[in-house]
């Protein structure tokens, strides 16, 4: 039930941290103009990994694409890379472990085989989640460089009689989804990879021999002792099953290696 | 198509109150005061969102005027405190259209500071 | 604060003239976010409330004739009327619509010769 669970909860925290590596590969409010000590702005500014937006205070929006891949800085051009990159791993990383779900019947699929497809799974997601934060991350620090510097020539202009202000960009939401998106990937990912030992069965793992000890039967199995596997659970001479280690929730009365929960 | 109409001008003396109205119809985001005393050039008061009430103001009217809203009677209103002879003036309330611009205008209502 | 500013403050001209009014401002106007210099144009004449002319420096209001011509980026603009109309005897004024404040030059009467 536990190996179930960790699954299930790895599975549904992958699947929001995609969604939301996807809404922020999507959103536009990369990087946002920075509006100093005023709330209220006359044209605000915001940009995406696609597009660049311009909201006024009249309510009016417009948005224009980036319509050229040569003219854009090869950071963006990385960023977005990372990004696709975590996406279709991500898309890939859930296909495989829709399949590898312990509560999901097909055929007569292994449990070695369901605990390949939830470890292939768990590295995709951990592998999708750091490329999410990692293009996030080198987009911040893009952000970072450029607010510095645009702040060291604040006003330029010619004697110092025209001023121009320079448009100051700072971290918009997406980075903030980004992130988040990412790391739930990473732990969905993790959690995927530790529900996977838990449904590999063992290498050693032996028939088991009854020894009959007078007054009560004991069974022993070699390859050592597991939890709730052995003891007090059989003690009527039957085969000892262990499909890697189960919870008391998940014992059934005639195990075979094609059951399953 | 939108139309504003402004209403609540008059004569009052200095130091005293006024509020004006502008009964709105029509989509507006946004709204603006602009006021012009006799005789002279355009003067920006203040804005508001209309959907969130929030406002700006131009320094020389911060602390003595205040903008607001009624979205139930979809009117844009202005009130004035401690008002000066130099308030004196025909005063707009015009929507803010694509470009920030004020593409529609009331008719205007006078206001007059004299004792 | 932007300041505006613009010249002439009043001009004579006949009907059929080009006349050309140009406007200052103490900062850029042009939005790096979309290119567009936030610079509007407005007509008013005696008693009436201002017209919208054109907007971002050179759109040209719907319903407003094309004799009515802008231009120009950054800090320096320029409304033309390429052809001077009786019905276009009135005050201009430009408005920075960059940033808050708003602010409106002192305005240009075009009077009859």
């Known amino acids: 039930m536990a190996v179930t669970a960790c699954q299930g909860l790895g599975f549904v925290v992958s699947l929001i941290g995609i969604a939301g590596i996807i809404a922020a590969t999507c959103m536009d409010q990369w990087s946002t103009q920075d509006l100093y000590n005023n709330p209220v702005t006359a044209v605000f500014n915001y940009q995406g990994l696609w597009r660049s937006c311009v909201r006024e205070s009249s309510g009016f929006t417009e948005c224009r694409g980036y319509f050229t891949l040569l003219g854009l800085p090869a950071m963006l051009q990385a960023v977005r890379a990372l990004m696709i990159v975590g996406i279709v791993l991500g898309a890939i990383g859930l296909l495989v472990s829709i399949f590898a779900l312990k509560c999901i019947r097909i055929g007569s699929m292994e449990d070695s085989a369901k605990a390949n497809m939830t470890l292939t799974s768990g590295i995709m997601f951990i592998v999708s989640g750091l490329c999410a934060i990692a293009g996030v991350s080198v987009f911040a620090n893009m952000l970072v460089t450029n607010f510095w510097m645009s702040t060291a020539n604040m006003y330029t202009g010619m004697g110092g009689m025209v001023q121009t202000v320079q448009t100051r960009y700072t971290f918009g939401a997406a980075l903030f989804v980004g992130w988040v998106a990412g790391g739930l990937t990473l732990i969905g990912g993790v959690m995927m990879c530790i529900a996977c030992r838990g449904l590999a069965p063992e290498e050693t793992n032996y028939k088991a021999v009854s020894y009959h000890a007078s007054g009560h039967s004991v069974a022993y199995k070699p390859g050592g002792f597991k939890a709730s596997t052995g003891f007090g659970s059989n003690t009527k001479n039957k085969k000892i099953y262990d499909g890697g280690a189960r919870t008391e929730d998940e014992v059934q009365s005639y195990p075979s290696k094609h059951d399953y929960v | 198509e939108v139309q504003l109409v402004e209403s609540g001008g008059g004569l009052v003396q200095p130091g005293g109150s006024l509020r004006l109205s502008c009964a709105v119809s029509?989509?507006?985001?946004?709204m603006n005061w602009v006021r012009q005393a006799p005789g002279k050039g355009l003067e920006w008061v203040a804005w508001i969102n209309m959907y969130t009430g929030e406002p700006t103001y131009a320094d020389d009217f911060k602390g003595r005027f205040t903008i607001s809203r009624d979205d139930s009677k979809n009117t844009l209103y202005l009130q004035m405190n401690s008002l000066r002879a130099e308030d004196t003036a025909v005063y707009y309330c015009?929507?803010?259209?694509?470009?920030?611009?004020?593409?529609?205008w009331g008719q205007g209502t006078l206001v007059t500071v004299s004792s | 604060d932007i300041q505006m500013t613009q010249s002439p403050s009043s001009l004579s001209a006949s009907v059929g003239d080009r006349v050309t009014i140009t406007c200052k401002s103490s900062q850029s106007l042009l939005n790096s976010g979309n290119q567009k210099s936030y610079l509007t144009w407005y007509q008013q004449k005696p008693g009436k409330a201002p017209k919208l002319l054109i907007y971002?420096?050179?759109t040209l209001e719907s319903g407003v004739p094309s004799r009515f011509s802008g231009s120009g980026s950054g800090t320096d603009y320029t409304l033309t009327i390429s052809s001077l109309q009786p019905e276009d005897f009135a005050t201009y004024y430009c408005q920075n619509a960059y940033s808050f404040p708003f602010t409106f030059g002192q305005g240009t009467k075009v009077e009859i010769k």
């Open positions: 971002w420096a050179s």
């Open positions: 029509g989509y507006t985001f946004s």
């Open positions: 015009a929507r803010t259209g694509t470009g920030n611009t004020m593409d529609y």
